[in-house]
């Protein structure tokens, strides 16, 4: 059954002068045998023999899509007129990387537009780009199979000191952004409250400047700055942070009232609203979602709700008046 019912009307294709009724009469056993579909493709209206003038449609397996003209036409000489058609992968396969590298998120297939982040064990950095995006059927930039981890010069320099510092005799002093940061270090997305702007900075430079008491610099996320939810949240959390009573150093970052420093990754991870402790006098009057009623929440609850990207309007600081 076809919604485009064929009552034998003489059709003319865009690129044909001949009407189907003008095709020569054929004997019953003539026609075309089943054509060979492209790799990762199949014939939708499959049968043993096709009549002259008959079309077959090429479809692709899940995860592939047709590129080119997807119809073959049976010709009087028993051959097929076929344009260039192929089934191209619409997903990227999980790349094969050296065992030392960790892929996040770890999936078998990735859709076009999805990105992965490659990370190394503590004290090591990826010797090359760390972020890759699935485009068409391949990764951009291409992932070299020799890509590996290298010793993080930051870790080497710092000795027993904190990040952004270096050992000088028996004491720790701030690294110089100019002198100590000529080596490669991973990119960070950083916000400068003075210029009210965000930019990509090498980790070494960011940590050295932060150590030199540049309090206006805020870590947003690992990797170069890219528009999206991560950047959006990074900027919002920077605004909220000024009222946080907790400021706990954590890797490149500082964790606030609504966060916990993950011991295994040295990253600040948002708590979930039920994990918030009631204490604290940093209160906000808010409106949740499409609700009209007002609610008093503490800064931890506000931070966790916004981090989870749930709709919430902050009406004013302090308790709701009603």
């Amino acid at each position: 059954f076809s919604i485009m019912e064929n009552n034998g009307q003489p059709c003319i294709n865009d690129d044909e002068e001949m009407k189907e009724v003008d095709l020569p009469e054929i004997e019953a056993d003539s026609g075309c045998p089943q054509p060979v579909p492209p790799e990762n493709g199949f014939i939708r209206n499959e049968k043993q023999l096709y009549l002259v003038g008959e079309d077959v449609e090429i479809s692709c397996l899940t995860g592939f899509e047709t590129v080119g003209y997807q119809y073959f036409r049976c010709l009087p000489d028993g051959t097929w007129r076929q344009g260039d058609v192929e089934c191209q992968r619409t997903e990227c396969i999980k790349p094969v990387v050296q065992e030392v590298l960790t892929i996040t998120p770890f999936q078998r297939l990735y859709r076009i537009g999805e990105s992965i982040e490659l990370t190394c064990p503590k004290g090591f950095v990826v010797a090359g780009p760390s972020r890759y995006t699935c485009q068409g059927n391949s990764w951009t930039p291409p992932i070299s199979n020799s890509l590996t981890c290298e010793k993080d010069t930051l870790t080497k320099l710092k000795g027993h000191c904190q990040l952004g510092q270096k050992q000088s005799g028996s004491e720790c002093i701030c690294m110089s952004p100019e002198e100590d940061c000529s080596h490669h270090s991973e990119d960070l997305c950083v916000f400068d409250t003075d210029s009210n702007d965000y930019f990509t900075s090498p980790a070494c430079k960011f940590l050295a400047e932060k150590c030199l008491n540049n309090q206006q610099l805020h870590f947003l996320h690992i990797g170069s700055c890219q528009d999206g939810r991560q950047l959006e949240w990074g900027l919002e959390r920077t605004r909220l942070s000024s009222n946080s009573t907790k400021k706990e150093s954590c890797g490149y970052d500082t964790c606030y009232d609504w966060e916990k420093c993950s011991a295994s990754t040295s990253k600040c991870v948002c708590l979930l609203p039920p994990q918030c402790f009631k204490g604290g006098n940093q209160l906000y009057c808010v409106k949740m979602g499409s609700s009209t009623s007002e609610k008093t929440l503490n800064i931890c609850e506000v931070g966790t709700i916004r981090c989870a990207n749930r709709k919430m309007e902050i009406l004013h600081p302090g308790k709701c008046l009603a």
Partner: antibody, heavy 118, light 112 residues
């Protein structure tokens, strides 16, 4: 030391009601959200409901909405779960749980068995 | 709802052996700001569940460091190096990245 002690459950007929309570000690009860989690013979562990510090916000799993009510009495350091219109599939051990900064369910009570059967 | 599939269902090991338990999610647990809320619990016979691992790989308070967690996206693993007799029970993974919070069906660990 954090302690959570659930009241005795029991056998209830389908359509019947039961109220569970959980006595909390060893921490400032009113400073924490609280939750109920159940463990059924067929469905395994399931989060049931959560309540905020003062009871002004409550959250439920879809299958118990409109039938179960979570509440608390901060003066008595007690958490409650009122279960109405009980069904056979509500048969489970019900645990009272408290979060920490590590997890939503960091501390658990010993559990109480609720059997819904005719 | 997110479905967490644990494998194997049962493990029978001798003390001192290392074992791994897999937890696969029906959807990625990585949220859009880069956080993954995946936990591991152990329920010893006749007891309530106890927290082992939080946020994929962080060790719960008082948990021996022979337990470790790893993974990302949809695939997670709990590893116990050098199993001890006291490790018997049912191991559950749990996710809180998407509402409602859901648990895996459990993996029973027995000692030979």
């Amino acid at each position: 030391e954090v302690q959570l002690v659930e009241s005795d459950g029991g056998l209830v007929q389908p359509g019947g009601s039961l109220r569970l309570s959980c006595a909390a000690s060893g921490f400032t009860f009113s400073d924490y959200y609280m939750a109920w989690v159940r463990q059924g013979p067929t469905k395994g562990l399931e989060w049931v409901a959560t309540i905020n510090y003062d009871g002004s916000s409550t959250y439920y799993r879809e299958s118990v909405k409109g039938r179960f009510t979570i509440s608390r009495d901060n003066a008595k350091n007690t958490l409650y779960l009122q279960m109405d219109s009980l069904r056979a599939e509500d048969t489970a051990v019900y645990y009272c749980a408290r979060p920490s900064t590590e997890a939503l369910f960091a501390y658990w009570g010993h559990g109480t068995l609720v059997t819904v059967s005719s | 709802d997110i479905v967490l599939t644990q494998t194997p269902l049962t493990l029978s090991v001798t003390p001192g052996q290392s074992v791994s338990i897999s937890c696969r999610s029906s959807q990625s647990l990585l949220n859009d700001v880069g956080n993954t809320y995946l936990y591991w619990y152990l329920q010893k016979p006749g007891q309530s569940p106890q927290l082992l691992i939080y946020l994929v790989s962080d060790l719960g308070s008082g948990v021996p460091n022979r337990f470790s967690g790893s993974g990302s996206g949809t695939d997670f693993t709990l590893k116990i190096s050098r199993v001890e007799a006291e490790d018997v029970g049912v191991y559950y993974c749990m996710q809180a990245s998407h509402a409602p919070y859901t648990f895996g069906a459990g993996t029973r660990l027995e000692i030979k």
